[in-house]
């Protein structure tokens, strides 16, 4: 099923000359699983463990993790083993670290807030800069001011309205009455002044099976940058797409199973069936990544009767670009992610 988390094995190769004799084995074969899968708390994913054996409740942010007890992929978590050198056996579930931003030649760290000038407050979140205005532009005065004009006032950052009366003497405007209109005006002005920004979606966090993709958007009531996420599945892990490449072809850019299917997520099933397309593979040193895609809303129904919906990447076409990097480096693609309009001869 297209969105089922792919069984993940974590193979951490220790650095040379390090003692790994004390590294415990968390996987046992043959598999020994309880007769029925566990019931996970609301919001915690039911996934296959890292041994590819049993269903387990995914480890959450701050929980310990091992090659068997894996972190929740739907929450963009990974197992950070850095605190367990040289064994690399028990880690802690951590959020995938976001990348920094560069604006006007200045580098900002992920999560850092800054003011590029006196008119805007900006935040760097995962490579995207979201800004909110510090100058609220109230409506220009009406009726009583025939020639309103915005002027810069020395010592003040934000421009202000002035009214040029018949004597051509500018005077600072003031509203004639203070009622509900002003509050509405403030809200509308806030929205008019909000520089709407939505970053591109990040590459999928996994090269096969279920992953997460994120973006930053300030298109909300507060005009504040928020992270949105969607589920993504670039290709199934259990299908060898190489065998499907036609004779004489170097790539199969898109793989589409013939049968439609229901998506499953954390034990819940999509309320309708889909026939998704996946990105394929190449015989040469090229990677196929989504080129034409959109985000769809998928509704899920759970065995306990509860339902929820998730945003999901829907692939229409894939672009096989010129080089493959480490498929586990989810940020590598950000450097040269193909823009729809830039792929040319």
């Amino acid at each position: 099923t297209a969105l089922s988390p792919a069984p993940t094995t974590m193979d951490f190769t220790p650095a040379p000359l390090e003692d790994t004799s004390s590294r415990p084995q968390f996987c046992k074969w043959p598999c020994e699983c309880p007769p029925s899968p566990p019931r996970c708390p609301l919001g915690v994913s039911l996934i296959t463990d890292g041994c590819e054996c049993c269903k387990m409740c995914a480890q959450q942010l701050g929980d310990n993790c091992t090659e068997a007890a894996i972190c929740d992929p739907h929450r963009g978590l990974y197992c950070d083993y850095s605190g367990d050198r040289p064994r690399y056996a028990i880690g802690v579930c951590a959020q995938v670290v976001g990348v920094g931003c560069v604006l006007d030649g200045v580098r900002y760290n992920n999560g850092q807030s800054f003011q590029p000038n006196c008119k805007y407050n900006c935040t760097c979140i995962d490579g995207a800069v979201g800004c909110t205005p510090l100058c609220l532009r109230v409506r220009p005065p009406r009726l009583w001011c025939p020639h309103p004009r915005r002027v810069s006032i020395p010592g003040h950052c934000c421009e202000q309205w002035v009214c040029e009366d018949d004597a051509k003497r500018p005077r600072k405007t003031a509203p004639r009455d203070t009622g509900a209109f002003d509050a509405v005006g403030e809200v509308e002005a806030w929205h008019r002044n909000c520089i709407a920004y939505t970053s591109p979606w990040s590459p999928c966090s996994t090269s096969c099976g279920l992953g997460v993709s994120t973006r930053i958007s300030n298109v909300n009531a507060q005009c504040w940058p928020e992270q949105e996420s969607r589920l993504c599945n670039l290709r199934p892990c259990d299908v060898d797409i190489h065998t499907l490449i036609k004779a004489g072809k170097k790539c199969l850019a898109v793989y589409q199973p013939e049968a439609s299917m229901n998506f499953t997520l954390a034990g819940c099933i999509s309320t309708r069936s889909y026939q998704p397309k996946y990105c394929g593979v190449c015989m040469d040193n090229r990677c196929c990544i989504p080129y034409k895609s959109k985000t769809i809303d998928v509704s899920f129904q759970c065995p306990d009767g509860l339902g929820f919906s998730r945003q999901v990447l829907w692939i229409n076409a894939c672009f096989c670009n010129l080089s493959c990097r480490n498929p586990n480096d989810i940020f590598a693609d950000l450097e040269s992610y193909p823009d729809f309009s830039e792929i040319a001869n």
């Epitope: 036609k246 004489g248 072809k249 170097k250 790539c251 199969l252 850019a253 898109v254 589409q256 990105c279 394929g280 190449c282 196929c288 080129y291 034409k292 895609s293 959109k294 229409n316 076409a317 894939c318 672009f319 096989c320 729809f340 792929i343 040319a344 001869n345």
Partner: antibody, heavy 121, light 113 residues
């Protein structure tokens, strides 16, 4: 109903470049690709290039490789064809045409009205 | 010189049946790629007439039919009418070592006598 509206006729000097646009309505560039085909006066149809859904790349006819660039802008549902180093033989009507991004679907469903490009000395 | 060949012209009287052939090679039609047909009336853009060897888009009269066998295909028009006078092009997809190409036949001018 899908419609393709192309930019107006162009007269260009030999050696110059031309950029023809093709605006899509009734569908989006997320679901289909736009290819370019030209027709010299009194001659047949000649495919120039477009996105090959199964190869996962923009491909070009041998005759045009290195001289033509096809691009798509999904934000405006507009495609462009840029042809460089024009010669008199490039005088033709240039058509854009749609292909649905579906495996094995290699035909052109809808066509633009055509853009006449005349190359003069 | 087209990779796919068509006769330059065919003619027929109103009401008659005419066929237009389209011959390819092992890298296009013979490789299993479909053949499609387009009609181009004088002074207009081409229009899809037959797709996938024998399928008609909605609005195309059933007087037009297509077939494919081996490395060739043909378009048949029965009950010929004056408004059928146009250029007809076959088209396929060619996949060879040099790359992928959409290929057109050289076109056939149909004259209704």
């Amino acid at each position: 109903e899908v419609q393709l509206v192309q930019s107006g006729a162009e007269v260009k000097r030999s050696g110059a470049s031309v950029k023809v646009s093709c605006k899509l309505s009734g569908d989006t560039l997320t679901d289909l690709s736009i290819h370019w085909v030209r027709q010299a006066p009194g001659k047949g149809l000649e495919w120039m290039g477009g996105f090959d859904f199964e190869d996962g790349e923009i491909v070009y006819g041998d005759k045009f490789k290195g001289r033509v660039t096809v691009t798509e802008d999904p934000s405006t549902d507009t495609a462009y064809m840029d042809l460089k180093r024009l010669t008199f033989e490039d005088t033709a009507i240039y058509y854009c045409a749609t292909i649905k991004d579906i495996p094995g679907r290699y035909y052109f469903d809808f066509w633009g009205q055509g853009t006449l490009v005349t190359v003069s000395s | 010189q087209s990779v796919v060949t068509q006769p330059p012209s065919v003619s027929g009287a109103p009401g008659q049946r005419v066929t237009i052939s389209c011959t390819g090679s092992s890298s296009n039609i013979g490789a299993g790629y479909d053949v499609h047909w387009y009609q181009q009336l004088p002074g207009t853009a081409p229009k899809l007439l037959i797709y996938g060897n024998s399928n008609r888009p909605s609005g195309v009269p059933d007087r037009f039919s297509g077939s494919k066998s081996g490395t060739s295909a043909s378009l048949a028009i029965t009950g010929l009418q004056a408004e059928d006078e146009a250029d007809y092009y076959c088209q396929s997809y060619d996949s060879s070592l040099s790359g992928s190409n959409w290929v057109f036949g050289g076109g056939t001018k149909l004259t209704v006598l």
